[in-house]
């Protein structure tokens, strides 16, 4: 018969910070030099032995004379209540197949963590506990005086707990949140009636949850150092160094090497020259509460992030070509680089790829003259593309070239006694065609009737017009733009000796918000094109003179420009250009892009006032300078009579009053006899012009009283 192997010498120690009980015991009567598999049952009670709060089994192999260890963590701080522990055992070994039975329980071991000393009447636990956000925490108070009423507050808000005995109440805080890095405050207040007997508080340190590092990646620029980076996520540091920021460690499994990183988001790893090509890194993030790790496995040659190219230069730069050169940092023999060039200029971007060994060179062609370009280059490993290097760039400017297009030239010819005054206009060449800075314009005037005679006028830029006084001969005028390199092709126009076609009638046209739609009859005979010019009807022609060239097979065009303003009249002239470059006026048109109502009313005179009539006249009223074509006039008449006079009809004014209205449809008819009036009667009149957009402004009526029949005016 075997002796029951009862656990003896049970000792229990505590760790307040970890809230743990540590048990150690031995087993008597164990055969010398024998190992047995045993099961130990452990019981833990709280406050009194009958209040068992935990029972569990612990299986292990026991040697003779061995001291056994086992730990248990309490949810409740150990200071809150006395704990009791006992243990019994059972042999569970194949060497003893006969039925086994439990030993007797050891005697209860009492565990009490006394931190409730001094003259204080209230205690709160645990002290300065560190937990992770989202965990459950149990706190308690111990009150010396059971007559006291104790209230507890978490961050100022009252919390409610469960009484464990008359002196102790525990509070379960579920899923505690992070509030601040200096901790969360909890305090309890003991009072009798309305009188506070004292307050005790604790600080609970709640750490943010340590995150797994994100975007972990390693790369080399020189095959000497690996540069590893990651996103650390939230810093879990707490105040007063209760928990420092999380640490990061790199571990490489093939070499077995480890490195504690000194930065929170990067770490350098020295590459040993032992031709290790494959790396298996584990990045371990760690704080006082947990560890998190991520892994990457890669081939070193697949992780090359080159230093940016250097010595970017431009050679043999001319107006349209340049050679771009650069250098790359050599990192290994026989290394092939893939480089990408970006060329920015004139609002465009071009991209080119080139494969190189050590020094880079690329021929940039089809460039625009006199243009600033920005060229930049970046490179990567051509064999195993991982990542482009940073850009290296430089600006360069191509040289000027002679202007490539003739200036767009037009003219206004005005006939004066014995000569022509020709005002010549030209548009500045676009940057695309100027090929540099235009310095001056050469205007060559050649008398076609006396071929040997010509004049050269040199006009400095940026002038865009000149006035020529010519006699009544035919002239050819050439305009040439010049920059530092050379001259543009010539723009040629011919001024004929004959006067312009004066017989052309002016036609009224209506514009739209989009501009003016113009059409004309084709010019008989050969034409090389048409020119439409226009200007503001009321202003000096030179003020805002514009023109547009139209092809020879076109007899209509739309003139649209933001410069057209509502209420402004524009005059258009359409010319045909003969093969001899002589302009012939074909049509004249005038109109408004948008008509407005008249801006003013005529000043009306009352003539020949008699007992039965009076005459109204407004001869001085100019119809030309109005914001629309004057179509006629409305004459408004008020009198005491019920009926309107002949030719007048009833009308309602904007103020709701009634009157009589007469419409004049001829804008040049600027007088009206108002007759069939009664002597010694009171009349009021008001005259306003109208356009397609409406009447002129409303104004006050003018009063007229007819004399008696015997008076003479």
């Amino acid at each position: 018969e075997r002796l029951p192997l009862t656990p003896v010498s049970l000792k229990v120690s505590t760790n307040s910070t970890r809230q743990s009980l540590h048990l150690q015991w031995t087993v008597h009567n164990l055969p010398y030099h024998q190992e047995l598999k045993m099961v130990f049952q452990i019981q833990i009670s709280r406050i009194e032995t009958s209040n068992v709060i935990w029972v569990g089994n612990y299986s292990t192999t026991v040697k003779w004379n061995q001291v056994l260890h086992w730990s248990w963590e309490s949810e409740l701080p150990l200071e809150c209540a006395t704990h009791f522990v006992r243990i019994k055992s059972l042999v569970d070994d194949a060497k003893f197949p006969e039925p086994n039975f439990w030993s007797n329980w050891s005697s209860w071991e009492e565990v009490s963590v006394q931190d409730s000393t001094g003259q204080d009447i209230l205690f709160v636990f645990p002290k300065d506990k560190l937990v992770e956000e989202g965990t459950n925490v149990t706190i308690c108070y111990v009150s010396r005086n059971i007559q006291n009423n104790v209230s507890c507050y978490l961050e100022g808000k009252q919390i409610h707990g469960e009484q464990l005995d008359p002196h102790v109440t525990a509070f379960n805080l579920n899923s505690v949140p992070f509030i601040r890095n200096k901790g969360t405050n909890i305090y309890c207040e003991a009072s009798q009636g309305n009188v506070s007997e004292g307050m005790k508080g604790i600080v609970l340190f709640v750490s943010k949850v340590l995150e797994e590092p994100k975007d972990f990646s390693c790369e080399t620029e020189d095959f000497k150092t690996l540069h590893c980076t990651w996103d650390p996520g939230t810093d879990t540091a707490l105040g007063w160094s209760k928990q420092p920021s999380q640490s990061y460690t790199l571990f490489e499994s093939f070499s077995g090497e480890k490195k504690l990183c000194t930065h929170k988001n990067w770490c350098n790893w020295q590459i040993t020259q032992d031709s290790q090509e494959t790396y298996n890194f584990t990045l371990i993030a760690e704080n006082y509460l947990r560890k998190r790790s991520v892994n990457i496995l890669f081939n070193l040659t697949h992780r090359v992030y080159l230093m940016n190219p250097f010595s970017v230069n431009f050679e043999n730069v001319n107006a349209t070509n340049a050679i771009m050169t650069w250098k790359v940092h050599s990192i290994r023999n026989n290394f092939t680089y893939l480089c990408q060039i970006e060329l920015h200029g004139e609002g465009k971007m071009m991209q080119y790829n080139v494969s190189i060994k050590v020094n880079g060179e690329y021929f940039l062609s089809e460039l625009e003259p006199a243009t600033e370009y920005m060229a930049r280059v970046r490179c990567a490993d051509a064999s195993h593309f991982w990542k482009w290097s940073e850009w290296s760039g430089q600006n360069f400017t191509t040289l000027e070239a002679a202007p490539s297009e003739a200036p767009d030239v037009w003219r206004i010819v005005s006939l004066e006694p014995g000569n022509h005054t020709v005002t010549l206009f030209w548009k500045p060449l676009s940057k695309l065609h100027a090929n540099g800075k235009i310095l001056f314009y050469n205007v060559v005037v050649e008398n076609l009737d006396k071929p040997s005679s010509s004049e050269l006028h040199s006009i400095p830029a940026p002038a865009n017009s000149t006035k020529l006084i010519l006699d009544r001969c035919s002239y050819q005028i050439c305009v040439i733009a010049n920059n530092s390199v050379g001259a543009s092709p010539a723009s040629v126009i011919v001024i004929s000796a004959d006067p312009e076609n004066k017989e052309v009638e002016e036609e009224r046209i209506a514009g739209t918000e989009g501009g003016f739609s113009l059409s004309w009859k084709p010019q008989p005979g050969d034409v090389i094109g048409y020119v439409v010019d226009w200007c503001d009807h009321t202003q000096d022609v030179l003020g805002d003179f514009q023109w547009k060239n139209v092809g020879p097979n076109t007899t209509s065009t739309v003139i649209s420009t933001d410069a057209f303003r509502p209420g402004v009249r524009y005059d258009f002239r359409i010319y045909g250009l003969s093969t001899k470059r002589i302009a012939c006026l074909l049509e004249k048109k005038t109109g408004y892009s948008q008509e407005l109502a008249p801006s003013d009313n005529p000043h009306v005179l009352v003539d020949t006032l008699t007992s039965h009539s009076f005459t109204l006249s407004w001869k001085d009223y100019s119809t030309e300078s109005q914001p629309g074509f004057i179509q006629g006039y409305h004459v408004y008449l008020k009198s005491k009579a019920r009926q309107c006079h002949p030719r007048f009809e009833k009308a309602v004014l904007s103020d709701g009053s009634e009157c009589c209205k007469y419409k004049i449809d001829n804008p040049e008819e600027k007088a009206l006899i108002v007759d069939n009036l009664k002597p010694e009667s009171f009349y009021e009149f008001f005259i306003t012009p109208f356009t397609s957009a409406g009447e002129g402004p409303s104004a006050t009526f003018t009063k007229v009283t007819t004399p008696d029949e015997h008076s003479s005016m």
Epitope: Y153, I179, Y187, M199, I202
Partner: antibody, heavy 126, light 110 residues
Framework: QVQLVQSGAEVKKPGASVKVSCKAS????????INWVRQATGQGLEWMGW????????GYAQKFQGRVTMTRDTSISTAYMEMSSLRSEDTAVYYC???????????????????WGQGTTVTVSS | QSVLTQPPSASGTPGQRVTISCSGS????????VNWYHQLPGTAPKLLIY???KRPSGVPDRFSGSKSGSSASLAISGLQSEDEADYYC???????????FGGGTKLTVL
């Protein structure tokens, strides 16, 4: 009864240092944190920092960092506040004050100050 | 310039109810409890209210505190002549890592 008794008035020259003491009685000195607050004539209250008499840990307002040192002698239940490099604008009444909650912590939490010393007038003048 | 803003003065007649406001930000009043002190001329400050609305023993129930968002207020009902004093609000500021006070309100009993 619970009280804090401070040392007497001090007159100092600019650039000098001053050390003000605060003796506690009527309660367990190491159970309650001590704050220091000053008040210039006709001005409001200005918090300078705290000290945990149990752990000796301190925390100072940013304005006073490097110029103020708070210490204690638990054997005589006394807290001290020393201020160096004095300037004329440091002329004020300096108070020590006990936190209302006896905090079971090595650190600090502000709940309010229920017991105040009588104040020590420090005059800085050349 | 104080971190917490109080009106410089307030007044009332005996028996009246007076309220003193204290406004701060999310890092102070918005996320911490508020205390109120009063100070009679030539004496040390005295704690009136702690944890927003709790009164230490000996403070009459005529004094009450409240908090809403990042503002707090102290109400004194049944005003008495001995209530004439300077009143200060105070709290912890998480950004400044320290205790902050209001500039003080001088209460006059007319």
């Amino acid at each position: 009864q619970v009280q804090l008794v401070q040392s007497g008035a001090e007159v100092k020259k600019p650039g000098a240092s001053v050390k003000v003491s605060c003796k506690a009685s009527g309660y367990t000195f190491t159970s309650y944190e001590i704050n220091w607050v000053r008040q210039a004539t006709g001005q409001g209250l200005e918090w300078m920092g705290w000290m945990n008499p149990n752990s000796g840990y301190t925390g100072y307002a940013q304005k006073f960092q490097g110029r103020v040192t708070m210490t204690r002698d638990t054997s005589i239940s006394t807290a001290y506040m020393e201020m160096s490099s004095l300037r004329s604008e440091d002329t004020a009444v300096y108070y020590c004050a006990r936190d209302i909650v006896a905090a079971n912590t090595d650190y600090y939490f502000y709940y309010g100050m229920d017991v105040w010393g009588q104040g020590t007038t420090v005059t800085v003048s050349s | 310039q104080s971190v917490l803003t109080q009106p410089p003065s307030a007044s009332g007649t005996p028996g009246q109810r007076v309220t003193i406001s204290c406004s701060g930000s999310n890092s102070n009043i918005g996320s911490n409890t508020v205390n109120w002190y009063h100070q009679l001329p030539g004496t040390a400050p005295k704690l009136l209210i702690y944890n927003i609305n709790k009164r230490p023993s000996g403070v009459p129930d005529r004094f009450s505190g409240s908090k809403s968002g990042s503002s707090a207020s102290l109400a004194i009902s049944g005003l008495q002549s001995e209530d004439e004093a300077d009143y200060y609000c105070s709290t912890w500021d998480d950004s400044l890592d320290g205790v902050v006070f209001g500039g003080g309100t001088k209460l006059t009993v007319l």
